[in-house]
């Protein structure tokens, strides 16, 4: 019967006793940077071309016995997971292997850098179709390795990497921490994070999504027909590389940003038990398990958005945190979050010709996160409209006044340390959805966008008594672009988007002992693009 991992990534409409997805990734070439491989294994023979690239360090220890099958074990298994004819994800994809890990699975940053350069030169000399580069390795944070990944990604190559098996924040490792790379954590048959001895999958904001990574059956280098079970984030990354190859084969013109958004969109949501992660990492770690799209075509009409968390600002009084979208994405809204609740809000600002989301720490605060909502919105023209703190008691307001511009997000930012704790919340007058409102002490920022066929609406959910969490979701066919809290409650820790749901978090009322701080209202801005829907109908 079908291995559990292949069943897990297969949408229900394709499920059968055998894994037979509609497109095998035949237009895509996958580069594997790993150990040597046994290319004559019948699972991968004819599918994997072993390049002459080799850059590995000496094995440790004078008594190390170099056994071919052990040297090839990791790479052979991963090649099988990506494109194996029996237990592979993208059965039609062709692969090229580069040896950057020795027989003990060790490599160097310089070896990997030279490997990436080898791929870049190969691409220049003989341009082929879409390229996916699988980096099933993780080492300490390396600015130079991350920069090399960025260069290759900007040349149009899709890089997929393992989050690492250290049960730690993936942002501390490279290439997992490179924003341009698709970073993959590992889950098991129960959709739980993979434990590996005393360690396990890495987690955190640098992980894009998870994928099957425990007891994964694949080609064994022991013999030509041997199969073996292996576990780890390398196996998880191999699944995503295979899914990416299939998506790119179906839609070869997809950009990295479009591919990442689709991977996120088609993932299984909220199936991972977050209790496995350290408490401070739960909100930052995406609860997504990779899956193939239900159809490899026709997703173009959707407005895709994802949430990008910044690094932590640190606790200093004037500390700020910045969240950025990828080059091809539009920043449609900006929010902030602080576990202590002490923050001075957030704002969208231009940096290097692109909007970024900046969050501000407050005096006595333990630090803040900036949360960007990054979307694919072709032909968009977005700008930020700011209203300085108002003198009137009605509070600060700002709206999108340009013809054809719609409100996609609201942010507020204040200079004062204490934002009038006991003032009642300002209520938005009904019938004016195209404006942001806030405290009179705060400056308010409206993200206003014009794009063909773009329409947005505001959705609110208020709870009269304080609650730790208030949510509001966009309905089917609409995409969450903005998430904020109505002003007036000092116990709000911040707001952030989780998939298509706006989450407003408040301080635990039981610990503050006060219930007089009023209602909490979560405000979602939900958008859709009629233009994208019409464009896709014309294509079919």
């Amino acid at each position: 019967s079908i291995p559990w991992n292949l069943e897990r990534i297969t949408p229900p409409r394709y499920r059968a006793d055998e894994y037979q997805p509609p497109d095998g990734g035949s237009l895509v070439e996958v580069y594997l940077l790993d150990t040597s491989i046994q290319s004559d294994h019948r699972e991968i023979e004819g599918r994997v071309m072993v390049t002459d690239f080799e850059n590995v360090p000496e094995e440790d220890g004078t008594r190390f016995h170099r056994q071919a099958s052990k040297c090839d074990s990791h790479g052979t298994h991963l090649a099988g997971v990506v494109s194996g004819r029996d237990a592979g994800v993208a059965k039609g994809a062709s692969m090229r292997s580069l040896r950057v890990l020795n027989c003990q699975g060790k490599g160097t940053v310089s070896g990997t850098l030279i490997g990436l350069e080898f791929i870049r030169k190969s691409q220049l000399v003989q341009p082929v179709g879409p390229l996916v580069v699988l980096l099933p390795l993780a080492g300490g944070y390396s600015r130079v390795l991350n920069a090399a990944c960025q260069r290759l990604a900007r040349a149009g190559v899709v890089l997929v990497t393992a989050a690492g098996n250290f049960r730690d924040d993936a942002c501390l490792y490279s290439p997992a921490s490179a924003p341009e790379v698709i970073t993959v954590g590992a889950t098991n048959a129960q959709d739980q994070p993979v434990t590996l001895g005393t360690l396990g999958t890495n987690f955190g904001r640098c992980v894009d999504l998870f994928a099957p990574g425990e007891d994964i059956i694949g080609a064994s280098s022991d013999c030509s027909t041997c199969f073996v079970s292996q576990s780890g984030t390398s196996q998880a990354a191999a699944h995503v590389a295979g899914i990416a190859a299939m998506m790119l084969s179906a839609e070869p013109e997809l950009t990295l940003a479009e591919l990442r958004q689709r991977l996120i969109h088609f993932s299984a949501k909220d199936v991972i038990n977050e209790a496995w992660f350290p408490e401070d990492q739960r909100v930052l770690t995406p609860n997504l398990v990779a899956a193939l799209p239900p159809s490899t075509h026709g997703a173009g009409w959707q407005l895709f958005c994802r949430t990008v968390w910044s690094a932590h600002s640190g606790p200093t009084r004037m500390a700020t945190a910045v969240a950025r979208c990828a080059p091809d994405e539009e920043l449609l809204s900006c929010s902030s979050f602080s576990r202590s609740g002490k923050r001075r809000g957030e704002r969208m600002e231009a940096q290097g010709g692109k909007l970024v989301c900046r969050a501000h720490n407050a005096f006595g605060g333990e630090g803040v996160y900036a949360i960007a909502r990054c979307c694919l919105l072709p032909q968009a023209n977005c700008s930020v409209h700011t209203a300085p703190p108002a003198e009137a008691s009605m509070g600060t307001r700002v709206h999108c006044h340009q013809q054809g511009h719609v409100l996609t997000g609201c942010s507020s930012h204040w200079e004062v340390e204490d934002l009038g704790t006991h003032k009642p919340p300002v209520l938005r007058p009904r019938g004016q959805p195209n404006q942001c409102v806030g405290h009179r002490e705060a400056s308010i920022h409206a993200s206003c966008c014009h794009a063909p066929g773009l329409e947005c609406k505001v959705k609110e959910h208020g709870i009269p008594a304080p609650q730790e969490q208030v949510t509001v979701a966009c309905e089917e066919g609409w995409t969450l672009t903005g998430c904020s809290a109505l002003p007036g409650t000092s116990h709000v820790l911040g707001a952030y988007a989780v998939d298509n749901t706006c989450v407003v978090r408040s301080r635990d009322v039981s610990t503050t002992g006060s219930t007089s701080e009023g209602a909490v209202t979560a405000v979602a801005i939900c958008c859709r693009s009629r233009h994208l829907a019409q464009a896709s109908q014309e294509l079919q």
């Epitope: 699972e43 029996d86 059965k91 199969f227």
Partner: antibody, heavy 119, light 113 residues
């Protein structure tokens, strides 16, 4: 039920060409390998090669490489063994058999095709 | 190539008696990654195709009588028919299926004494 049905016996002259077939049914043909095995009169079994109909990957026993061609048409769940120029020494019973990645041994066999090459 | 050598070439056993066939491979077919021996046993009766009896050296195929058993590991293997029946008259082959080309033993003919 799962079965492999082979084409009928053939009598040929040396130098002639021949293509024998093996049709699978009762299982997902593209997800299993088909092997061809030769048995010369009164002799043992010799593995000739294998094909994966899903992508037409083949692997030959070096002894038979260049002597025969293994192919498949997945649309009709059929594998083939062919000769471009038969020799008297090709006289034998030829069996097809299937195997799977999780069971890489031959669990189902065809009934065999007897090929006789004589002038 | 892995060479498979069976012994004896032929064997005559009384009905109800034990028949033992040996098979030796020129290199180990036991693999550490999954701790399995990549060895199978087949039975071929006159005018019929081979039939799978045993795989992974000791796992009986469904429908095969329990008088057939396989044992051994690494390079030395044994097929045992605990109580020979008339219908067991056949040629028995061992096969290694780990490495290309896949190879068979030369066969052992089992007859009734």
């Amino acid at each position: 039920q799962v079965q492999l049905v082979q084409s009928g016996a053939e009598v040929k002259k040396p130098g002639e060409s021949l293509k024998i077939s093996c049709k699978g049914s009762g299982y997902s043909f593209t997800n299993y390998y088909i092997a061809w095995v030769r048995q010369m009169p009164g002799k043992g079994l010799e593995w000739m090669g294998i094909i994966y109909p899903g992508d037409s990957y083949t692997h030959y026993n070096p002894k038979f490489q260049g002597q025969v061609t293994i192919s498949a048409d997945k649309s009709i769940s059929t594998a083939y063994l062919q000769w471009s120029s038969l020799k008297a020494s090709d006289t034998a019973m030829y069996y097809c058999a299937r195997d799977h990645w999780s069971r890489p041994f031959s669990d189902v066999w065809g009934q065999g095709t007897l090929v006789t090459v004589s002038s | 190539d892995i060479v498979m050598t069976q012994s004896p070439d032929s064997l005559a056993v009384s009905l109800g008696e034990r028949a033992t066939i040996n098979c030796r491979s020129s290199q180990s077919v036991l693999y550490s990654s999954n701790n399995k021996n990549y060895l199978a046993w087949y039975q071929q009766k006159p005018g019929q195709p081979p039939k799978l009896l045993i795989y992974w050296a000791s796992t009986r195929e469904s429908g095969v009588p329990d008088r057939f058993s396989g044992s051994g590991s690494g390079t030395d293997f044994t097929l045992t028919i605990s109580s020979l029946q008339a219908e067991d008259v056949a040629v028995y082959y061992c096969q290694q299926y780990s490495s290309f080309p896949i190879t068979f033993g030369q066969g052992t003919k089992v007859e009734i004494k």
